[in-house]
């Protein structure tokens, strides 16, 4: 009874299409599959960024796989052929592993890359990224930002840089069509006549870095003798009401009465007849139903009632800026 063997896939490689971290892992079928013509072989692919403790594992019948990686580090991958038990009289047969690696040859010392990269997607409409120049780089150093997400034919360079002392220190992005809920890849590289500059790679999803505008139209409504309803409206823009969480800060007679987090544009407050002044502010953030993370908006303008009878039906007062 001869032992059944199968070869590993051939020509296993990682191909970089220039998408700043989105790579193709591809291979050819193994040699000598003639004995298994009626059999669909499978491939078990394992890959990771070098330094990561865990491998991602994929089993596929195709001859490629695509995924995103951190190009600040190297990538390692391995693959072997699997013959399902239906092809081999009852036991799964695996080939030896074929292995490959990929990394971008680093230029320049790590200190030359940009520092404190910060990107914010304002009101789910305007992406702005800013950074500080690397440590010890000369004024002739300039940084360039490139970005890509699935849907773009190729990586694009920033066309609207924010400058300080003639150096690029940020980028205002154009309208980014169909760019959320997918990985957004950025590379900031640099050039200097003096010395090579290290590139930096960043990946995030835009819906997770949204900073909304603050809520607007804050109002008070008397619900009963001891209850006041605080109401506000979502700000103008593309973010639907279902995507907001709110934090309210309410002050009664200059002492903080309540800080609360709510999901709707209302909050009902218990009051006493002794209340002489009531003020509240509210801020918003994208909630867990629409993103994995987010940034709190600025506080709204402050809305106050003061010195009038709280039994009035509606209390609408002019805005005071909240500090």
């Amino acid at each position: 009874d001869t032992e059944i063997k199968v070869n590993p896939p051939q020509d296993f490689e990682i191909v970089d299409p220039g998408y700043l971290g989105y790579l193709y892992l591809q291979w050819q079928p193994p040699l000598s599959l003639d004995h298994f013509k009626e059999c669909t072989v499978e491939y078990e692919l394992k890959y990771r960024n070098i330094g990561s403790e865990t491998w991602k594992t994929i089993i596929t019948k195709n001859l490629h796989y695509k995924d995103g990686f951190d190009l600040n580090k190297g990538i390692e991958a391995k693959i072997h052929t699997l013959l399902p038990w239906q092809c081999t009289n009852g036991s799964e047969v695996q080939s030896s592993w074929a292995e490959t690696t990929y990394w971008i040859s680093p230029q320049g010392i790590p200190e030359t890359k940009v520092q404190d990269m910060d990107c914010v997607y304002y009101n789910w409409q305007y992406l702005l990224c800013s950074w500080k120049p690397g440590i010890g780089v000369l004024l002739d150093t300039n940084y360039n930002l490139f970005y890509w997400y699935e849907g773009l034919d190729h990586a694009l360079q920033c066309v609207d840089y924010i400058k300080a002392d003639g150096q690029n220190i940020g980028c205002r992005f154009p309208y980014l069509e169909a760019s959320d809920y997918k990985d957004f890849y950025i590379c900031v590289n640099g050039s200097s006549e003096n010395k090579p500059i290290r590139s930096s790679y960043f990946t995030f999803q835009l819906q997770n870095i949204v900073k909304p505008l603050p809520p607007v139209y804050l109002t008070f409504t008397r619900e009963s003798s001891c209850e006041i309803k605080l109401k506000w409206s979502i700000p103008l823009g593309p973010i639907p009401a279902r995507c907001f969480d709110y934090e309210i800060e309410i002050r009664e007679d200059d002492t903080t009465l309540v800080t609360a987090t709510v999901e709707n544009e209302t909050y009902t407050l218990k009051t006493t007849n002794e209340t002489r002044q009531l003020c509240f502010v509210v801020r918003s953030k994208v909630n867990i139903y629409c993103s994995d993370d987010g940034i709190w908006s600025e506080w709204s303008d402050k809305q106050c009632w003061e010195g009038e009878d709280l039994s009035k039906k509606t209390l609408l007062r002019h805005h005071h800026h909240h500090h």
């Epitope: 191909v15 299409p17 193709y24 079928p29 019948k61 195709n62 001859l63 490629h64």
Partner: nanobody, 121 residues
């Protein structure tokens, strides 16, 4: 099934040029990768150039700077323009595609018979 027909090989003097063609026919639903390989007797086949997913082009070894791969999607064809040929380019050049059959669900790999390129020393 799927047939790959190469042409354009032959005998060419060092420094000369050749243009290889490969036409794909048969019941193919999508062509995802197109490549040229070459093989010398008693040696492992080596990849020369490929057009892969997203029309990404990649060259290997000594092909960089001398060879140009291109495709004509309308004709289901792939070409290899070879310039500045050297004796060490002598080999059988084989066309390969990775794609999905009209009757299939997964990618498969298909090969042409090959065309001989000879550059005498």
């Amino acid at each position: 099934q799927v047939q790959l027909q190469e042409s354009g090989g032959g005998l060419v003097q060092p420094g000369g040029s050749l243009r290889l063609s490969c036409e794909v026919s048969g019941s193919i639903f999508s062509i995802n990768r197109m490549a040229w390989y070459r093989q010398v007797p008693e040696k492992e086949r080596e990849m020369v150039a490929q057009i892969t997913y997203g029309d990404t082009i990649k060259y290997y070894g000594s092909a960089k700077g001398r060879f140009t791969i291109s495709r004509d999607s309308a004709k289901n064809a792939v070409y290899l323009q070879m310039n500045s040929l050297k004796p060490e380019d002598t080999a059988v050049y084989r066309c390969n595609i990775v794609g999905v059959l009209t009757t299939g669900h997964y990618e498969d790999s298909f090969w042409g018979q090959g065309t001989q390129v000879t550059v005498p020393s």
